[in-house]
């Protein structure tokens, strides 16, 4: 922490201008008004403090806001952004598309992905929800950052909304997210035809159920691997061999090139060999002729 | 990210003079302030001077009369004419943006030594 002394008369600041560059540490600390500071953030940005320098500016303004800052001085923080831990941001309240732009841009090559989320986060709250506004900035300015949202924040997204997100977008949204998702890009795209009604829906099918895959399947879709292997487990495993056929169209033949991967491996493991072997891939592993399939949890001898 | 190469250094005795250069890669230096800071053994890291992206410009105390700092932005380059050099000049002296002094991001810098 810098040392409190007392501001020598001529230093005393009545503006925040490039002067203050010259100005010691211990002197921002002693003659730099936080009130001052906060009225002219907006200067901020412009002006090349160093790296110390602002360290000293953001403890004037977390001393004048402990409670967190207003969106007023949030606006206008350019580089001091790149200062904020989440635990900072957290104390925010941020309703403006114009100060998420802003701060987007300033953390673009940084190191910065907890705090961006923690920021994409407090708008959502503030906003109400994740609006069209909010997706569409999102998607412009920080792609892929919509997964930064908890399942609970993106259960706040309308199904109407669901068109803007590209798929690129959701590259890195975990299973948990897709689960929220995908209902609602079921809602969004139901009254389109097939074939147009798959490429929209295909992004988010890692969070659909067997039902909604095996529905596919009879719909000559002719699924990619990249798109399958994203399933869950769980919509996997039930499909039959033949339904796999169907879903994977000619794109059949890279299940020999996943056979080791999940959710392949897993759903190899739970066919027949000799249904495997109609697939003509040379698939192993599968149950052999002759074995019975036990489902200890339906207690049934299934044949 | 920004590249900033410093030159124009070197060992001169006290009251000559040096010219020191701030070449920037890209188009950074339109529209922003530029500063000259430098850095002696084992002191803090200080600014110089300063030019606005007006072309105003503001000097440290310790400099004022003798130093003097300008800019060419179709050329993306700034420079520090340095007058009446003293032992306590001495340093390595760098230049920076807003941006770039913000991240801790500094070019090599170039050392100015002042010794007879």
């Known amino acids: 922490d810098v040392e409190r002394t007392t501001c020598p008369p001529e230093k005393e600041v009545h503006e925040i201008d490039e002067s203050l560059i010259f100005y010691k540490k211990r002197e921002l600390e002693a003659c730099v008004d936080a009130a001052l500071l906060a009225a002219q953030m907006d200067r901020v940005d412009a002006i090349p403090f160093t790296y110390e320098q602002l360290d000293v500016l953001k403890h004037k303004l977390d001393e004048l806001y402990p409670q967190g800052y207003p969106e007023s001085v949030i606006r206008h923080l350019g580089h001091l952004f790149l200062k904020m831990s989440p635990e900072d941001i957290r104390k925010w309240n941020v309703t403006s598309l114009e100060t998420l732009k802003a701060l987007l841009k300033v953390s673009k090559g940084h190191e910065m992905s907890a705090q961006v989320a923690t920021l994409i986060d407090r708008v959502v709250v503030g906003r109400g929800q994740l609006d069209k506004d909010t997706v569409d900035t999102l998607t412009a300015f920080c792609p892929g950052c919509l997964c930064s949202l908890s399942p609970e924040r993106l259960s706040s997204v309308p199904p109407s909304v669901i068109g803007a997100v590209r798929p690129q977008d959701l590259d890195t949204c975990g299973p948990r997210q897709l689960d929220v998702l995908y209902p609602k890009a079921r809602l969004a795209f139901q009254n389109m035809s097939g074939s147009e009604y798959f490429v929209k829906i295909r992004p988010f099918l890692g969070g659909a159920p067997t039902e909604d895959v095996k529905a596919l399947s009879q719909q000559n879709v002719s699924m990619d691997l990249a798109t399958f292997m994203k399933l869950r487990r769980e919509a996997v495993l039930p499909l039959t061999v033949a339904e796999v056929q169907k879903l994977l169209g000619p794109h059949v033949e890279g299940l020999k090139v996943e056979e080791q991967h999940s959710p392949v491996r897993d759903w190899i493991l739970k066919q027949r060999q000799d249904d495997l072997d109609t697939l003509g891939l040379g698939l192993q592993g599968g149950i052999p002729n002759g074995y019975l399939i036990l489902d200890l949890s339906v207690r049934e001898a299934l044949s | 990210q920004v590249q900033l190469v410093e030159s124009g250094g070197g060992l001169v005795q006290p009251g000559g003079s040096l010219r020191l250069s701030c070449a920037a890669s890209?188009?950074?230096?339109?529209?922003?302030?530029v500063a000259w800071y430098r850095q002696a053994p084992g002191k803090e890291r200080e600014a110089v001077a300063v030019?606005?992206?007006?072309?105003?410009?503001k000097y440290a105390d310790s400099v004022k009369g003798r130093f003097t700092i300008s800019r060419y932005n179709a050329k993306n380059i700034a420079y520090l004419q340095m007058n009446s050099l003293k032992p306590e000049d001495t340093a390595v002296y760098y230049c920076?943006?807003?941006?770039?002094?913000?991240?801790?991001?500094w070019g090599q810098g170039t050392q100015v030594t002042v010794s007879s």
């Open positions: 890209g188009s950074i230096f339109s529209g922003n302030a």
């Open positions: 030019i606005t992206r007006d072309g105003d410009t």
């Open positions: 920076n943006t807003a941006r770039g002094a913000a991240v801790d991001s």
